[in-house]
């Protein structure tokens, strides 16, 4: 048969952050090419990344159609010069991916502190509401639009002059915290989805400190 030197893909892995979703697999092809198909549990298979020598395929456009659906992908292997060729059972070799539910499993990207503003003994810290590739009515939704109150942010803050940290939570993108007048503070935030069992927390944002560009001070 024409598939004697064709090997099935393996280690199929979903890599997804803020719904940007790529399927990766092995091995690097030698005299073979790959095509990927994706479907929901009840839907039809859709082919992507036709006859590619890559070992990854960006499936974002498919999964953002409904991020709460559960998806399955499969990777077909074909001989490089003869993509019409099939395996011994009359089917090309393929391997299934694990199931993937974007809403429950996409990693939360590192958040960014957009700004902070001090008014007297209060500081308003605002977290950037990152745009995703999820669309509704032809507009891209933000992370908050997609997750709503399921997404919270944890703020860590501390006086620049000491190591003792404090924390606060919000299910919006804003914190209003009490500070000591005349003290400079540093801030870092983390995104969390409490209801999840996997990929629950993001990495911490870069630290931002008062007395630097992002801040504003009003008496």
């Amino acid at each position: 048969s024409g598939t004697t030197n064709t090997v099935a893909a393996y280690n199929l892995t979903w890599k997804s952050t803020n719904f940007k979703t790529i399927l990766e697999w092995e091995p690097k092809p030698v005299n073979q090419v790959y095509t990927v198909q994706i479907s929901t549990k009840s839907g039809d298979w859709k082919s992507k990344c036709f006859y590619t020598t890559d070992t990854e395929c960006d499936l974002t456009d498919e999964i953002v159609k409904d991020v709460k659906q559960t998806y399955l992908a499969r990777v077909f292997s074909y001989p490089a010069g003869n993509v019409e060729s099939t395996g011994s059972a009359g089917e090309p070799l393929y391997e299934n991916s694990p199931e993937f539910t974007p809403y429950l499993e996409t990693n939360l990207g590192q958040p960014t502190i957009q700004s902070f503003e001090q008014v007297g003994t209060k500081v308003n810290v605002t977290v950037e509401d990152e745009r995703t590739l999820v669309r509704r009515n032809n507009t891209f939704l933000s992370l908050r639009d997609v997750f709503g109150k399921d997404l919270i942010y944890t703020l860590y803050y501390w006086k620049s002059s000491s190591s003792g940290k404090k924390t606060a939570k919000t299910n919006t993108n804003e914190f209003l915290i009490d500070v000591d007048k005349g003290e400079n503070y540093c801030f870092s935030v983390q995104a969390v989805i409490p209801s999840r069992t996997v990929n629950r927390k993001s990495t911490d944002s870069p630290v931002e400190c008062m007395g630097q560009e992002k801040g504003e001070f009003r008496e």
Partner: antibody, heavy 117, light 107 residues
Framework: EVQLVESGGGLVQPGGSLRLSCAAS????????MHWVRQAPGKGLEWVGW????????IYDPKFQDRFTISADTSKNTAYLQMNSLRAEDTAVYYC??????????WGQGTLVTVSS | DIQMTQSPSSLSASVGDRVTITCKAS??????LSWYQQKPGKAPKLLIY???SLADGVPSRFSGSGSGTDFTLTISSLQPEDFATYYC?????????FGQGTKVEIK
């Protein structure tokens, strides 16, 4: 099955030190926040502090900041409470608890620390 | 720091009674409040989170209400297994603080 098991409690003299352990099973501690809460005999619950085991961030009630240190070893799936300069008023049952960021859903059975000469 | 004032500190009630326990925060904590039940010699058990959401496996006779500074735990019809001490916890900002507890005793 999710389980938290505290150990390391016992009798210690005033001024002494003790390290409590909270061994977790059934989940990965780095995916959650881990807290220590204590309860003096016949009294209410008192929050001690938390750790995010993934990045080592710790938060304490200021009254414990100078004497207590929370740490975690993700390879052992265990959180720790190091207590120094212990006083009679630190006598309590010490609990560890898992925090989803919305609530403390699992608690250990507690370990009794008695500070007495 | 946020103070949580819980009342009453104790109450006597009979099986079937409706019981209400309140917690007042010294400032706005939005809905970052949970309620726990503790029996002697045991660890606390989660009842209510986000002020109003019933935790998994908790009987529907327990309910929570409130947001901002005023919160209530209600047991609609007290059962024998409900005699215990109840605590509120604010976790909106550190230091997290518990209420002083309410001991529900048999009348």
């Amino acid at each position: 099955e999710v389980q938290l098991v505290e150990s390391g409690g016992g009798l210690v003299q005033p001024g002494g030190s003790l390290r409590l352990s909270c061994a977790a099973s059934g989940f990965n501690i780095k995916d959650y926040y881990m807290h220590w809460v204590r309860q003096a005999p016949g009294k209410g619950l008192e929050w001690v502090g938390w750790i995010d085991p993934e990045n080592g961030n710790t938060i304490y009630d200021p009254k414990f900041q100078d004497r207590f240190t929370i740490s975690a070893d993700t390879s052992k799936n265990t959180a720790y409470l190091q207590m120094n300069s212990l006083r009679a008023e630190d006598t309590a049952v010490y609990y560890c608890a898992r925090d989803t960021a919305a609530y403390f859903d699992y608690w250990g059975q507690g370990t009794l620390v008695t500070v007495s000469s | 720091d946020i103070q949580m004032t819980q009342s009453p500190s104790s109450l006597s009630a009979s099986v079937g009674d409706r019981v209400t326990i309140t917690c007042k925060a010294s400032r706005d904590i939005k809905s970052y409040l949970s309620w726990y039940q503790q029996k002697p010699g045991k660890a606390p058990k989660l009842l209510i989170y986000y002020a109003t959401s019933l935790a998994d496996g908790v009987p529907s006779r327990f309910s929570g209400s409130g947001s901002g500074t005023d919160f209530t735990l209600t047991i609609s019809s007290l059962q024998p297994e409900d005699f215990a001490t109840y605590y509120c916890l604010q976790h909106g900002e550190s230091p997290f603080t518990f209420g002083q507890g309410t001991k529900v005793e048999i009348k």
